[in-house]
């Protein structure tokens, strides 16, 4: 007994399609061994026709493909424009020869069943509508006019000219003539399902002068769309449902035990399961819409149906469009947290994945909301101004290159909790679900600058602290100045080599700014955080206010230009045993350097290149310094 | 919603045939896969697949079958009835069991149950040695 499982028998007609899936067993070798068709001829050689080597026989040139589902053990073979020399007996199988593991499908392509000569054949999708023309003549005009589906015996009415009609026609059937033209009438069947595919004969006037014609009607199910996407990335099904039901409500659903499980409607009705990661979005006129399901996850996987009614939930007769989802746990998007957790008054830094061979992609945040359809307005970009309610507590920093953009968001309040989400306008899969959780603070936070009230004086020099706790003390620190482009790091040198001790004392760690002369630019919101590397963490921000010099109040000196232009990481040492070398910060390019030019300055790769200018053109300073004051025990 | 009620079942001797129909009703019938799986006795809650049937429109069929029933047991439809027949021949003692006839709208695999929709209540079948 084979373990390879697929159709006995597949029957269809000339000029149809056929989708025969094979299914194998869950093994690694299984999942990545040859595929292939074969068909059997009289001295039980089987002959390849396509396989997932790439090989495509000539006769099945254009119209045939053999797609393989390593994560569903499956592998499909789709072949279009079927001929009855198509009629045979194959093998589906695996291995390197066609001797392997494999399974035997008997292929039967029929004629097109004999019909009348004068047969009008009309194919529709279920839950669409017909409409059936009959022709008659003139002296049929003032004759009753029927239209029947034909049994195995007789001819059932479905309705006729009297306004008979057949009860499973009732409200779908209309039997009608259209303007003056007495020699046509026509019968319009709506919302069709596969009970109405037959054979019919509309008819006007009776006996032997009778007008008939026959009519074939086909009722097709949409075949499921495979769709094959990776864990924790996002799908989108687009659903084309057509004209007529343009005003109706749209639902996305999925196949469950005994029903079609409602995921999401127009009408707002939302599957808890996929709070936070899903949106409906009416795409015109015509009854388009689409569904955007973002992080992925394994349960995702099964069989989901769009549809349309004015119920927004699944109706016989109703069109339908389907897909079958396979969710592949293989995936090439990282496995980040997918809650991030807050306190009021702090900061959460959070590293979006994108796809690394895009580091020249635009990146936004957006804020999921779930009211409505739901909708993901953008909060910050690359190219994206924050949003002013967001203003001083909001940045994006693109890392280029590295697959990682970070989104700073600090001064946190309980409304910010929800739900976040990470896009690019490049790979769409790689949009990703950050849920945000934000608690009351319990304790004072890991950073605090001081003085809190900053008021700087105009030409003055003027100096912010930033206090930071001895689990700090190896990370890397920053001062940044914030605008709605971005916060961009104040410039730094590196005063080379400083030796500390073991000891810490968590009263002196501090990183200084200091503005000085302080010009009007400088009012506004700055920051101060810590990072290792490319790996941003936590953050406070300040507003510094800038006030004209009242009378009396001391004139500093503006210093020599290039003084003004540095800002030293200072560190005050006592006593050592540990070297600690602090990390540059080179000034960041203006908000249109190109990619290449920012790819080139190397570890400049960590700023944000949405940001504004590094320094003031008239040669103010922007200074940050780091005390460490360590006693040895 | 949809309801399968199936017939047929009876006593019958090793080797004779029996015929099963499993009659949709209820909202008007539009899955398009069916089968037919069983229940030996003492074997409960396991089901074990018999015979599918997948159909992509009134033109192209799909039919599965178990090993175990392969060359005995035909699957068909009659669409105008509503109505999904299971023809078993050559039957042994070993396919004594409850028969249950399933739909739904699609399934990843005709021989996993729980991907149909809709169950009947059964039918029994004994076959006699």
């Known amino acids: 007994k084979s373990p390879i499982f697929g159709p006995q028998e597949v029957s269809s007609i000339e000029g149809d399609s056929v989708s025969i899936t094979c299914y194998y067993p869950d093994t690694s070798v299984n999942r990545h061994t040859r595929k292939y068709w074969c068909r059997q001829g009289a001295s039980g050689m089987c002959t390849t026709l396509i396989s997932s080597n790439g090989y495509l026989s000539k006769e099945y040139s254009g119209r045939a493909n053999l797609i393989n589902f390593p994560e569903n053990n499956t592998f499909v073979i789709n072949i279009e424009q079927l001929t009855q020399d198509d009629t045979g007996s194959y093998k589906c199988g695996l291995g390197t020869s066609n001797r392997g593991l494999s399974f035997d499908v008997s292929l039967e392509v029929s004629q097109v069943p004999e019909l009348p000569s004068d047969t009008h054949v009309y194919t529709k999708d279920i839950g669409r509508n017909v409409t059936i023309e009959c022709p008659f003549k003139r002296e049929n005009a003032p004759s009753k006019k029927s239209l029947c589906k034909k049994t195995n015996q007789s001819c059932e009415l479905v309705i006729d000219s009297t306004e008979k009609v057949n009860p499973s026609y009732i409200g779908r059937a209309k039997l009608f003539m259209k303007g003056t033209d007495l020699t046509v009438f026509y019968v319009n069947i709506s919302h069709l399902t596969h009970n109405d595919a037959g054979l019919y004969i509309c008819q006007a006037g009776e006996g032997p002068s009778a007008d008939k014609k026959n009519v074939d009607l086909q009722v097709l199910a949409p075949e499921p769309e495979l769709l094959y996407k990776d864990l924790r990335s996002s799908v989108t099904f687009e659903c084309d449902l057509g004209r007529e039901v343009a005003n109706e409500a749209k639902y996305l659903c999925r196949m469950n035990k005994e029903t079609c499980d409602v995921i999401i409607n127009t009408l707002g009705k939302r599957d808890p399961d996929f709070e936070g990661r899903i949106l409906i979005t009416p795409k015109d006129d015509n009854g388009r819409f689409s569904v955007l399901i973002t992080g992925l996850r394994k349960e995702d996987a099964g069989h989901y149906q769009c549809g349309a009614h004015s119920s927004g939930l699944p109706q016989e007769g109703w069109p339908i469009q389907t897909w079958q989802l396979f969710v592949n746990e293989e995936s090439t998007i990282p496995n980040r947290r997918s809650v991030v957790k807050g306190v009021t008054g702090g900061s959460v830094a959070i590293a979006c994945p994108y796809n690394p061979k895009e580091s020249s992609s635009l990146k936004y945040w957006c804020r999921w909301e779930g009211d409505g359809n739901g909708h993901c307005p953008v909060l910050v970009g690359t190219q994206a101004q924050v949003q002013e309610e967001y203003e001083g507590r909001l940045a994006l920093f693109d890392q280029p290159g590295n697959g990682t953009y970070t989104v700073i968001l600090n001064q946190l309040t309980t409304e910010d909790a929800g739900f976040y989400w990470c896009l690019t306008n490049g790979d769409s899969r790689w949009r990703t679900t950050i849920e945000l959780q934000v608690a009351e603070a319990t304790r004072e936070p890991n950073l605090e600058v001081t003085p809190q009230n900053a008021t700087a004086v105009l030409g003055e020099t003027f100096t912010v602290s930033c206090h930071y706790p001895c689990k700090f003390y190896s990370q890397e620190k920053y001062w940044c100045k914030w605008s709605n482009k971005g916060c961009h790091i104040l410039p730094s040198h590196d005063e080379g080599a400083r030796q500390s001790s073991v000891s810490c004392d968590q009263s002196s760690q501090l990183v200084s700014m200091t503005l000085n002369p302080v010009s009007k630019e400088d009012e506004g919101w700055y920051w101060c955080g810590v990072k290792q590397g490319q790996t941003y963490g936590e953050t406070t921000a300040i507003y510094i206010a800038v006030e004209e010099r009242t009378r009396g109040s001391s004139h500093v000196n503006p210093t020599d230009a290039n003084a003004r232009a540095k800002v030293a990481l200072e560190e005050e040492v006592v006593d050592s045993s540990i070297s600690e070398k602090e990390n540059k910060a080179i000034p960041n390019p203006g908000p249109f350097a190109n990619e290449r030019e920012i790819q080139n300055v190397g570890d400049q790769a960590q700023e944000n290149r949405a940001s504004g200018d590094a320094g003031s053109a008239d040669g103010q300073s922007r200074s940050s310094s780091s005390k460490h004051h360590h006693h040895h025990h | 919603e949809v309801q399968l009620v199936e017939s047929g079942g009876g006593l019958v001797q090793t080797g004779g045939s029996l015929r099963l129909s499993c009659a949709a009703s209820?909202?008007?019938?539009?899955?398009?896969?069916m089968g037919w799986f069983r229940q030996a006795p003492g074997k409960e809650p396991e089901r074990d697949f018999v015979a599918a049937l997948r159909w992509s429109n009134d033109r192209t069929y799909y039919k599965y079958y178990a090993d175990s029933v392969k060359g005995r047991f035909t699957i068909s439809r009659d669409n105008a009835k509503n109505t999904v027949y299971l023809q078993m021949n050559t039957l042994k003692p070993e396919d004594t069991a409850v028969y249950y006839c399933?739909?739904?709208?699609?399934?990843?695999?005709?021989?996993?149950?729980?991907?149909?929709?809709?169950w009947g209540q059964g039918t029994q079948v004994t076959v006699s040695s």
């Open positions: 209820g909202r008007t019938f539009s899955s398009y896969a």
């Open positions: 399933a739909g739904g709208n699609y399934f990843s695999d005709p021989r996993v149950d729980k991907e149909y929709n809709y």
